[in-house]
Interface confidence: medium
């Protein structure tokens, strides 16, 4: 199931995925002056089996004599819902990216690709936020957002991050910490990505729920 909307916007912050869940689509977009080759794919698709995931299809751009009129593909699933596209600033390759089951790594750049990548995320996808250059991160909780679904309606959880206008950059999980840092940061914030993006739940689990009751009378 594709996510209806884009991940939430945090002022002075950008987000990225460390790995992409199977089913994720990446539009084959070309930079100005280039277009997708006629026989080329509209998008790349993260597919795989139990042991290995990879991107199907290859994006190819060719020079265009006319203005770039490449259509943006918005995949329509069975439900025919309108899907918004998600823009990613120039692709950033995380350092030592964890190899998660059922996930693809950041696809390598293709020749003459557009400066922005447009992903179509699926339910269960997690993205991580960092403050842009010149802003410092204040964490009230995890600086991440997950796409979840309730009765077929998708939503992104709200990342607990505020970026303040102080000169210090915040890092994505798995990225190198700057040499000089005005204040010590917990090691956990810069450690490699943990496998929290795998949302498969055992269907055979025994779930129990006990309810109890309290009442309060107004005096």
């Amino acid at each position: 199931e594709l996510c209806d909307d884009d991940p939430p916007e945090i002022p002075h912050a950008t987000f990225k995925a460390m790995a992409y869940k199977e089913g994720t689509m990446l539009n084959c977009e070309c930079k100005r002056g280039f277009r997708r080759i006629k026989s080329g794919s509209l998008y790349m698709l993260c597919t795989g089996n139990s042991s290995h995931s990879s991107w199907d299809n290859q994006c190819q751009c060719t020079s265009s004599a006319t203005r770039n009129t490449t259509k943006q593909v918005t995949p329509q699933p069975e439900e025919q819902k309108e899907r918004k596209t998600t823009e990613m600033q120039s692709p950033m390759q995380p350092v030592d990216q964890a190899s998660l089951p059922g996930h693809c790594r950041e696809p390598p750049p293709w020749e003459n690709e557009a400066t922005e990548r447009i992903y179509h995320f699926v339910v269960g996808q997690m993205v991580y936020y960092q403050c842009v250059q010149g802003y410092r991160a204040l964490h009230r909780g995890p600086a991440e957002s997950v796409c979840k679904m309730t009765h077929g309606k998708t939503r992104w959880t709200q990342p607990q991050l505020i970026c303040t206008g102080e000169m210090e950059t915040s890092q994505f999980p798995g990225e190198e910490k700057p040499q000089a840092s005005p204040e010590g940061r917990p090691e956990s914030e810069t450690s490699c990505l943990v496998t929290t993006t795998d949302f498969q739940i055992q269907t055979e689990m025994a779930a129990t729920m006990e309810t109890s009751i309290f009442t309060t009378e107004y005096q």
Epitope: E1, E79, G124, M149, H151, Q158, M205, A207, T208
Partner: antibody
Framework: PGATVKISCKVS????????MHWVQQAPGKGLEWMGL????????IYAEKFQGRVTITADTSTDTAYMELSSLRSEDTAVYYC????????????WGQGTLVTVSS | QPVLTQSPSASGTPGQRVTISCSGS????????VYWYQQLPGTAPKLLIY???QRPSGVPDRFSGSKSGTSASLAISGLQSEDEADYYC???????????FGGGTKLTVL
């Protein structure tokens, strides 16, 4: 009537924060009425218009317990209240509690 | 008054095929998935169909769901006495921003 009731729902057998927690009302001999939900991961709630302002749904991740508080009780609130979980990847309320009967009488 | 409309009752004989319908609008069934729940007498509801036509593990293939426009149907083939229950349809409603249920259909196996 006029009182507030708070029902708790303790779960086990799965990771509490991976599922939404819904609350559903069923008056005697009547159908199901959705009251609202909480996402235990971030505490975000969505309430049904009918119960807005009278219902508060919360989740305590330290005890894997969800709560539903209904205020300004009236006789028509006499019902069985179910807590029920929904897989956030599949959708659909797939595990239901046994229900708690609340009787409002003067 | 329930947002989704179901006929209050339906009946059939063992082995027969029965269909329960659920009617909504463009803001619920028309643009979102439909879910079906079975409530046996004196018990909590149970998820029967999700995402219009998918069966959770453990639900017999005698139960099938379908959707067309702003209406949905639950079909039960090879009716059995243990299928006697109340059946509810549900969907997300974009206008109300929440889950809406049908009024329920009481199925009697004659």
């Amino acid at each position: 009537p006029g009182a507030t009731v708070k029902i708790s729902c303790k779960v086990s057998g799965y990771t509490f924060t991976d599922y939404y927690m819904h609350w559903v009302q069923q008056a005697p001999g009547k159908g199901l009425e959705w009251m609202g939900l909480v996402d235990p991961e971030d505490g975000e709630t969505i309430y049904a218009e009918k119960f807005q302002g009278r219902v508060t749904i919360t989740a305590d991740t330290s005890t894997d317990t969800a709560y539903m508080e209904l205020s300004s009780l009236r006789s028509e609130d006499t019902a069985v209240y179910y807590c029920a979980t929904e897989d956030t990847a599949m959708g659909g309320i797939d595990y239901w509690g046994q229900g708690t009967l609340v009787t409002v009488s003067s | 008054q329930p947002v989704l409309t179901q006929s209050p009752s339906a009946s059939g004989t063992p082995g027969q095929r029965v269909t329960i319908s659920c009617s909504g609008s463009s803001s619920n069934i028309g643009s979102n998935y439909v879910y079906w729940y079975q409530q046996l007498p004196g018990t909590a509801p149970k998820l029967l169909i999700y995402s219009n036509n998918q069966r959770p593990s453990g639900v017999p293939d005698r139960f099938s769901g379908s959707k067309s426009g702003t209406s949905a149907s639950l079909a039960i083939s090879g009716l059995q006495s243990e299928d006697e229950a109340d059946y509810y349809c549900a969907a997300w409603d974009d206008s109300l921003n929440g889950v809406v249920f049908g009024g329920g259909t009481k199925l009697t196996v004659l």
